[in-house]
């Protein structure tokens, strides 16, 4: 996960656009990253990065508790 | 109406300090990045750093070797931006700005002029 | 850091002619299919002021005869007519990363 948002957020050289990448990244369960993003207001490039970094972070988690379910049948 | 209101001039002798604010009314503080660039006497305009409100985040111009600091208090929607060990090249006029949409200046504070002299 | 190179430093020219700067960028200030240009005008003892962001949109209030065009690296902000009121110092600005970096300036004087 941690390599993949890495890669994901080097592209993005503005710094707030980069944490705006990182902040879509921490785990919220109570909320949908659309949800999340609808409360940024610094501008696009901000939700932009967020949810492309929140999608591909939830992506990621699901994936591999997917994995960890067939393990562990 | 937006409005970026800067201190007044200020005379500094060489190796002191100088404290500059910049007091943003008429749009929500938080929402935007405030930056600070400057401009020598003739010269064209050198971006110095800025500042998110919202979350304190900051990022400045290596040029000034951390002699440039970047605050801001939310309660009273005022940036501020210090700048130690001045010398005398650091004469100029220092402006803020509003960046919108992470993309543009759109309004600027009127200026302050800081000299340096011994 | 991106270095953005105007030219020329200064241009006279006469009213209701074209006047032409140049800005070339070090690096493309494009981000998946956005520009990150901006310009500005600077009149003696007064702050910048807005005119283009995003390569060629004009900023409100912004005479319709200032345009900005280019892509990638090689920007252009026009004036045309020129009028008496645009004397002044011109700058282009990239927005795409940090530092923020200005072009050294285009003096335009009226003849």
């Known amino acids: 996960l941690q390599e993949k948002i890495e890669e994901i957020a080097a592209k993005y050289k503005h710094l707030v656009v980069k944490k705006c990448c990182y902040d879509g990244v921490r785990i919220n369960h109570d909320e949908t990253c659309e949800q999340r993003a609808a409360r940024i207001s610094v501008g696009p490039r901000c939700v932009k990065a967020f949810t492309e970094c929140c999608v591909v972070a939830s992506q990621l988690r699901a994936n591999n508790s997917h994995k960890d379910l067939q393990l562990g049948r | 109406q937006v409005q970026l209101v800067q201190s007044g001039a200020e005379v500094k002798k060489p190796g002191s300090s100088v404290k500059v604010s910049c007091k943003a009314s008429?749009?929500?503080?938080?929402?935007?990045?405030i930056h600070w660039m400057r401009q020598a006497p003739g010269q064209g305009l050198e971006w110095m750093g800025y500042?998110?409100?919202?979350?304190?985040?900051?990022n400045y111009n290596e040029n000034f070797k951390g002699r440039v600091t970047i605050t801001a208090d939310k309660s009273t929607s005022t940036a501020y931006m210090e700048l130690s060990s001045l010398r005398s090249e650091d004469t100029a006029v220092y402006y803020c700005a509003r960046e919108r949409n992470l993309e543009y200046f759109d309004y600027w504070g009127q200026g302050t002029t800081v000299t340096v002299s011994s | 850091d991106i270095v953005l190179t105007q030219s020329p430093a200064s241009l006279a020219v006469s009213p209701g002619q074209r006047a032409t700067i140049t800005c070339k960028a070090s690096q493309s200030v494009d981000f998946e299919g956005d520009n990150y240009m901006n310009w500005y005008q600077q009149k003696p003892g007064q702050p910048p002021k807005l005119l283009i962001y995003a390569t060629s949109n004009l900023d409100s209030g912004v005479p319709a005869r200032f345009s900005g065009s280019g892509s990638g690296t090689d920007f252009t902000l026009t004036i045309n007519p020129v009028e008496a009121e645009d004397t002044a110092n011109y700058y282009c600005?990239?927005?795409?990363?940090?530092?923020?970096?200005f072009g050294g300036g285009t003096k335009v004087e009226i003849k």
């Open positions: 500042i998110y409100p919202r979350e304190g985040w900051t």
């Open positions: 600005q990239q927005s795409l990363e940090d530092p923020h970096t």
């Open positions: 008429g749009y929500t503080f938080t929402d935007h990045i």
